[in-house]
Interface confidence: low
C-alpha cells in the first residue's frame, strides 16, 4: 500500500453539486480522436452566494506531437512509449460574464482545479466518488491547511544574473494586453521521482497528476502569450535516476548533471521540471536556475506540497518563471502586482503565503521580455509541429494551424481587433493579425527594421512588404571577425568565454600547453596532440556542481561522473589567427566558405552565415539585385 | 587598447562606507570581465569582485560577501564598488582590471586608488 500524503486538510470549504449543462444538439459523425470527453463542456457551480457559469474547452494543446512517457517495466528494463488514443479530461476556460475570469480543470473523476473571478481565486476538488454531479469542495487557497513555501533562489544570486533592479524599468502595461510580440513555446519535459510516484501510489495517478500540473502552469502563462507544452513524462516508478536530496540545490545539479547525460537519447527539450515528492529542508519547496531557459541549465525542482495540485502548479510556474530570467517580486522597487493584497501575492513573490497566486506581475513581465531579447530564448520561438497536435487545429489556442489565418485565443481572452476570435479568419479589411510586420492590421512597408542587430555577429532584419512576420534571423557570414573570435551560427566562441560559462566569472582558458592532452577515458592516459580542438581545459573559477573534474599538472577539464566523455571545445572556436575548430580539428577558416557568397549580393547585401545573400533594406533576395517595389509591382498585390 | 582610470578612494573610519569607480575608455567593446583587485601592505593582490559586462554575473571573495556590491553603467562604460561597513582589513590600494575576449587574463590596469580604514 502507498504511504498516505502528508497533505494538509481543507479549514473551510462550501459543499456543491455541480450541474452540467446540456451541450448543442448536433448530430454529426465525430472524429475518433475526440475519444469519452467532450471538445467543450459547461458546468454551472453555486458557491459564495453567486451561480458561477464555467464554460470549458479541451486543451488540445497539452501534449505535443512526440509525446513520450518512460518508465521502468516489470522486467526492471527501462521503456520509453507514444501511448495511442491520447484522448484526456484536462480543460481551461473562463466564467460567464466575468470579463478577466480563468479557469483550468480536469473533469476525469468529478471536477478538480481553480477558476478564478476576478481577485479570488476557487478551488474545486470531489467529496466522494460520486464523480461530475457528486459533492464537490469549493473553497479559497487560504483555508488549505498548510504552511507557507518559498523558493529557494536566493536574492543574491539572483541579483548577480539580472542585473540592477529599478523601479524606471517598469512601465506597467494595461492590465488586459497581451505582449504584442509572437506567441513564444516551452516544450517541457518532466520527471517524477520515487517518492513522489510512492505517494500517489500509480503511474496511472502520477499521469493524471503531472497532466493537471501542466494544464494550469500552461493557463497561467498563456497571459504571457506562452503555451507550455509537455513533450515527454518520466516516472521513476522503481528507483530515482539521480540522488534527490532534501537540499533542493544538490537536487537541482544532480537534476541538470543527469540531464545532460540523458540529452542524447531522449526528447530535445526546452526545459526540464523534476516533481519531487521529497521533503526539501525548511519552507523551500522550489529551486531554479535563473535566466538558464533554452541552455544546458534550464530546469528547476519542486517539491509537491499540497494536496491540491495547483500548489505544485504554482510552483513550477514559479520556478519556470526564474528560468526565464524573472526576479522575486520583493527585490524589485515599484514592482507591481494587480493581485488584491487580501487575495495573495503575484506568481514570482518569494514565498507563496496562504494562498496560491494567478497572475504575473508588471515587473515579471518586463523580465521576460529583456529575456525574450536574448539571442538565447531562440528555443521558445518554435511552436511545436501544428500539423501534429494532438487532437488537431482548434480555433482559440494562440496556434495558428491548418485552416486559420489568426488565432488570438478564446473571444473571451482575445484582444486583437485584426482577427475574429471566433473563426480564427481576420476580420474585414484587415491584411494580417500577428507578426512584427504586423502593424493596424496591415503588413508594413517594405525596408522598415523589425529586428536589430543584437551584437557584431548578428544581422538586423528588415520588413520584406508582402509579409506580417519578420524574416527569419540570420547572423553574419561564419568566420567574420567578432571579439576574440571569429563568427560561427550567430555566437562568437572563445575558449575564454567558453571557461566561464561553465566555471563561473572566474574560468579563464588555461595554459597553452594543456590543450596538448588528448585525456582518454577514466582520466588515466594522455596523448599528444597538435591542437586546441581537443578536449576544453580550463583554470580558476569554481567547479561547476555535479560535474565531475579530470586534472593534469594545472589543467582541469569538465568529464561526465564515469569519465567516459570530457566537454569538447566547441565547434567554431578560434584556435590560432584565422584558424577555428572545425570537426575536431584547428583549420583555416576557408572551411566555413565554399565561394565567394558576398559577390553575388551586388553590393547590396552581404552574404550570412548560410551562404546566402541578406538584403539591404528595401532590396530583394536571393541576390539583392532589384528593388522590392520592383518585385513586387511584377508579381501583383499581397497573396 | 582600453584605459581604466579609478577614483573615489580615501581615509575612513571603520564601519564607513566608500564607493569606487572605474571608468573605461578606449576599446571597450572588447571587455568581457571587469573586476576589483587590491593590494595591502606585504600581501600578494587578491581578487574582491568581477562582474562579466555583458550579462552582468557577479562574484565576490568570501571575506566582502554582503558589504561590497561591485555594479556596472555600461552606457558610461564604468563599473562601481559599493563598500559598506568597512573593516581596517580593507586597507589596500584598490586596481580596477579589465579582461577582454580573446584574453583568459586581466590585461589592462589602472593606476590604482588607495583605501585607508582606520580604527
Known amino acids: 500500500i502507498a504511504p498516505s500524503r502528508p497533505w494538509a486538510l481543507m479549514e473551510q470549504y462550501e459543499v456543491v453539486l455541480p450541474w452540467r449543462l446540456p451541450g448543442p444538439r448536433v448530430r454529426r459523425a465525430l472524429p475518433s480522436h475526440l475519444g469519452l470527453h467532450p471538445e467543450r463542456v459547461s458546468y454551472v457551480l453555486g458557491a459564495t452566494g453567486h451561480n458561477f457559469t464555467l464554460h470549458l474547452r479541451k486543451n488540445r494543446d497539452l501534449l505535443g506531437s512526440g509525446y513520450t512517457e518512460t518508465y521502468t517495466a516489470a522486467n526492471g528494463s527501462e521503456v520509453t512509449e507514444q501511448p495511442r488514443g491520447q484522448d484526456h479530461c484536462f480543460y481551461q476556460g473562463h466564467v460567464e460574464g466575468y470579463p478577466d475570469s480563468a479557469a483550468s480543470l480536469s473533469t476525469c473523476a468529478g471536477l478538480r482545479g481553480f477558476f478564478q473571478v476576478g481577485s479570488d481565486l476557487h478551488l474545486i476538488e470531489p467529496l466522494d466518488e460520486g464523480g461530475e454531479g457528486g459533492r464537490h469542495a469549493v473553497y479559497q487557497a487560504e483555508h488549505l491547511l498548510q504552511t507557507a513555501g518559498t523558493c529557494g533562489v536566493s536574492d543574491d544570486s539572483l541579483g548577480s544574473l539580472l542585473g540592477p533592479r529599478t523601479a524606471a524599468v517598469f512601465r506597467p502595461r494595461p492590465g488586459d494586453s497581451l505582449p504584442s510580440r509572437e506567441t513564444r513555446y516551452v516544450e517541457l519535459y518532466v520527471v517524477v521521482d520515487n517518492a513522489e510516484f510512492q505517494m500517489l501510489g500509480s503511474e496511472a495517478a502520477v499521469r493524471h497528476r503531472v497532466l493537471e500540473v501542466v494544464n494550469h502552469v500552461d493557463k497561467l502563462y498563456q497571459k504571457l502569450n506562452f503555451r507550455v507544452v509537455l513533450v515527454g513524462l518520466e516516472i521513476w516508478n522503481s528507483q530515482d535516476r539521480f540522488h534527490v536530496s532534501p537540499d533542493p540545490s544538490v537536487t537541482l545539479e544532480n537534476l541538470l548533471t543527469w540531464q545532460a547525460r540523458q540529452r542524447t537519447r531522449r526528447h530535445l527539450h526546452d526545459n526540464v521540471q523534476l516533481i519531487t515528492g521529497v521533503d526539501f529542508t525548511g519552507t523551500t519547496v522550489g529551486f531554479a536556475r535563473v535566466s538558464a531557459m533554452c541552455s544546458h541549465s534550464s530546469g528547476a525542482v519542486n517539491q509537491d506540497h499540497s494536496k491540491n495540485p495547483v500548489g505544485v502548479a504554482c510552483t513550477m510556474a514559479h520556478e519556470m518563471g526564474h528560468n526565464l530570467g524573472m526576479d522575486h517580486d520583493e527585490n524589485v522597487q515599484g514592482c507591481r502586482c494587480q493581485e488584491r493584497f487580501e487575495a495573495g501575492r503575484c506568481i514570482m513573490a518569494g514565498s507563496i503565503g496562504s494562498s496560491f497566486p494567478r497572475m504575473f506581475s508588471d515587473c515579471s513581465q518586463a523580465y521576460l521580455e529583456s529575456f525574450l531579447e536574448r539571442p538565447q530564448s531562440v528555443c521558445l520561438a518554435n511552436a511545436p509541429d501544428l500539423s501534429h497536435l494532438v487532437g488537431g487545429p482548434v480555433c482559440g489556442n494562440l496556434f495558428v494551424e491548418r485552416g486559420e489565418q489568426c488565432d488570438c485565443g478564446p473571444p473571451e481572452d482575445c484582444r486583437n481587433r485584426c482577427c475574429n476570435s471566433t473563426t480564427c479568419q481576420l476580420a474585414e479589411g484587415a491584411q494580417c493579425a500577428h507578426g512584427t510586420c504586423c502593424q493596424e492590421c496591415k503588413v508594413k512597408p517594405a525596408g522598415e527594421l523589425c529586428r536589430p542587430k543584437k551584437d557584431m555577429c548578428d544581422l538586423e532584419e528588415f520588413c520584406d512588404g508582402r509579409h506580417p512576420e519578420c524574416p527569419e534571423d540570420a547572423f553574419q557570414e561564419n568566420g567574420t571577425p567578432c571579439s576574440g573570435g571569429y563568427c560561427y551560427n550567430g555566437a562568437c566562441p572563445t575558449l575564454a568565454q567558453q571557461c566561464q560559462a561553465f566555471w563561473g566569472p572566474g574560468g579563464q582558458a588555461a595554459e597553452e600547453s594543456c590543450f596538448s592532452y588528448d585525456i582518454l577515458p577514466g582520466c588515466k592516459a594522455s596523448r599528444y596532440r597538435a591542437d586546441m580542438c581537443g578536449v576544453l581545459q580550463c583554470k580558476g573559477g569554481q567547479q561547476p556542481l555535479g560535474r565531475a573534474i579530470c586534472i593534469v599538472d594545472v589543467c582541469h577539464a569538465l568529464t561526465t561522473e564515469d569519465g567516459t566523455a570530457y566537454e569538447p571545445v566547441p565547434e567554431g572556436t578560434r584556435c590560432g589567427p584565422e584558424k577555428v575548430c572545425w570537426k575536431g580539428r584547428c583549420q583555416d577558416l576557408h572551411v566555413y566558405r565554399s565561394s565567394n557568397c558576398s559577390a553575388q549580393c551586388h553590393n547590396h547585401g552581404v552574404c550570412n552565415h548560410k551562404q546566402e545573400c541578406h538584403c539591404h533594406a528595401g532590396w530583394a533576395p536571393p541576390h539583392c539585385a532589384k528593388l522590392l517595389t520592383e518585385v513586387h509591382a511584377a508579381s501583383g498585390s499581397l497573396p | 587598447e582600453v584605459q581604466l582610470v579609478e577614483s573615489g578612494g580615501g581615509l575612513v573610519q571603520a564601519g564607513a562606507s566608500l564607493k569606487l569607480s572605474c571608468a573605461a575608455s578606449?576599446?571597450?567593446?572588447?571587455?568581457?570581465?571587469m573586476g576589483w583587485f587590491r593590494r595591502a601592505p606585504g600581501k600578494d593582490r587578491e581578487s574582491v569582485a568581477t562582474?562579466?559586462?555583458?550579462?552582468?554575473?557577479?562574484y565576490y571573495v568570501d571575506s566582502v560577501k554582503g558589504r561590497f556590491t561591485i555594479t556596472r553603467d555600461n552606457a558610461k562604460n564604468t563599473v562601481y564598488l559599493q563598500m559598506n561597513n568597512l573593516k581596517p582589513e580593507d586597507t589596500a590600494v584598490y586596481y580596477c582590471?579589465?579582461?577582454?575576449?580573446?584574453?583568459?587574463?586581466?590585461?589592462?590596469w589602472g593606476q590604482g586608488t588607495q583605501v585607508t580604514v582606520s580604527s
Open positions: 582590471a579589465a579582461q577582454t575576449e580573446d584574453s583568459a587574463q586581466y590585461i589592462y
Open positions: 578606449g576599446r571597450t567593446y572588447d571587455i568581457r570581465v
Open positions: 562582474v562579466t559586462w555583458r550579462d552582468n554575473i557577479t
